[in-house]
């Protein structure tokens, strides 16, 4: 493949409040002492604040030349590499009802490509060969997605669609709206 890469910069993905479902209505009662306002927690946060910064899904920007055999792109292309940790749902904003945080182990999230973009590149070849046009598939954004037993490692569930299984004897929670499906696979020259 022979890609040359030069690291440019990094962007940290910090999920917005709007990415997560609203607190389920059955938790908003006297028993919880309005804990729903605090993400299901008492007013003070029962986890070390350093934990939040421990987890971040970063978009590292790389500039690369696309090669195809002896041919190389006239200009470098910039794409993202997803890196970093995705924390437990409980540590993320407004995550109440999304998981059973009191368990010692829970859903595993990974920072992986979310969207891709197609870019047409012109490859210059040695020996007076005519330039070739190629369409390459590049990572456009990263996202925390859940590893799930119903999928292969490569097929991951959107973080925003994960919903806790209803507890025994309780009304099932409405599942969050499904995120937009990834763009169709684009032709990958490399």
């Amino acid at each position: 493949q022979g890609w040359q890469a030069f690291k440019n910069d990094a962007t940290e993905i910090i999920p917005e409040l709007g990415e997560y479902p609203e607190p389920p209505p059955e938790l908003e009662n006297n028993k919880t002492m309005n804990r729903a306002e605090n993400g299901g927690r008492p007013p003070h946060h029962p986890f070390e604040t350093k934990d939040v910064s421990e987890y971040s899904c970063r978009e590292l920007h790389f500039t690369r030349y696309v090669t195809d055999g002896p041919c190389r792109s006239a200009k470098p292309v910039t794409e993202l590499v997803c890196s970093g940790q995705c924390g437990p749902a409980r540590l993320l904003p407004n995550a109440i009802g999304r998981g059973k945080w009191w368990r010692p182990s829970g859903p595993d999230f990974r920072c992986i490509p979310d969207r891709y973009r197609a870019q047409r590149v012109q490859l210059l070849c040695p020996g007076g060969e005519a330039p070739r046009a190629r369409k390459v598939r590049l990572v456009a954004s990263c996202k925390c997605k859940r590893l799930t037993r119903f999928h292969n490692q490569s097929e991951l569930k959107d973080f925003g669609t994960e919903a806790a299984r209803p507890q025994k004897g309780r009304k099932p929670r409405p599942r969050a709206r499904s995120a937009k499906a990834n763009q169709a696979e684009l032709e990958n020259a490399y």
Partner: antibody, heavy 119, light 110 residues
Amino acid sequence: EVQLVESGGGLVQPGRSLRLSCAASGFTFEDYALHWVRQAPGKGLEWVSGIGWDDDMIDYADSVKGRFTISRDNAKNSLYLQMNSLRVEDTALYYCAGNNRGYGGLDVWGQGTTVTVSS
Amino acid sequence: QSVLTQPPSASGTPGQRVTISCSGSSSNIGSNTVNWYQQLPGTAPKLLIYNNNQRPSGVPDRFSGSKSGTSASLAISGLQSEDEADYYCAAWDDSLDSYVFGGGTKLTVL
């Protein structure tokens, strides 16, 4: 100093009941989810039950479901395990453990209390 | 028999690097985070690694965790005599609806 101290263990006959207690100190009790983990003599660890800060945040291992009941009293900084219909295979060292980091493992442990079920 | 499979024993000499494996299935390690515990002889277990590869404060960086597919591993570099202990992996199992432990690995420092 963060501390969990178990008590209530002892020798009991099969079919009888026992209540274990775990007293917590050195941390804000309400902040922690609490669990019971047991270890039979010469064997590995076995998770028994866990509780968040509300009664609807409870889990049990299949081996104790319907026989054991976990509860907590935040006012008394205490965790309990009511064990009914005890069996010989329930003989073990019972640890009280806690976690306050979501899905972050059991980061606080007591020293354990021994339960022996024998006729 | 434990839901998570660990080798019953492992050994190494001081300064060496030792790896302990933990094999599970899609319903536990395959979809949930893995924790590792150390139990020194005659003492209560201690959390060593959480969320697959995170170390609680106070745990030396000689200890590291990793996970791939339905398996996890604990690596101990620069082995020391005080590392002689039983090591357990653990993860939530969605099928059993329980927190499951591996059978434990007894590490001997030769």
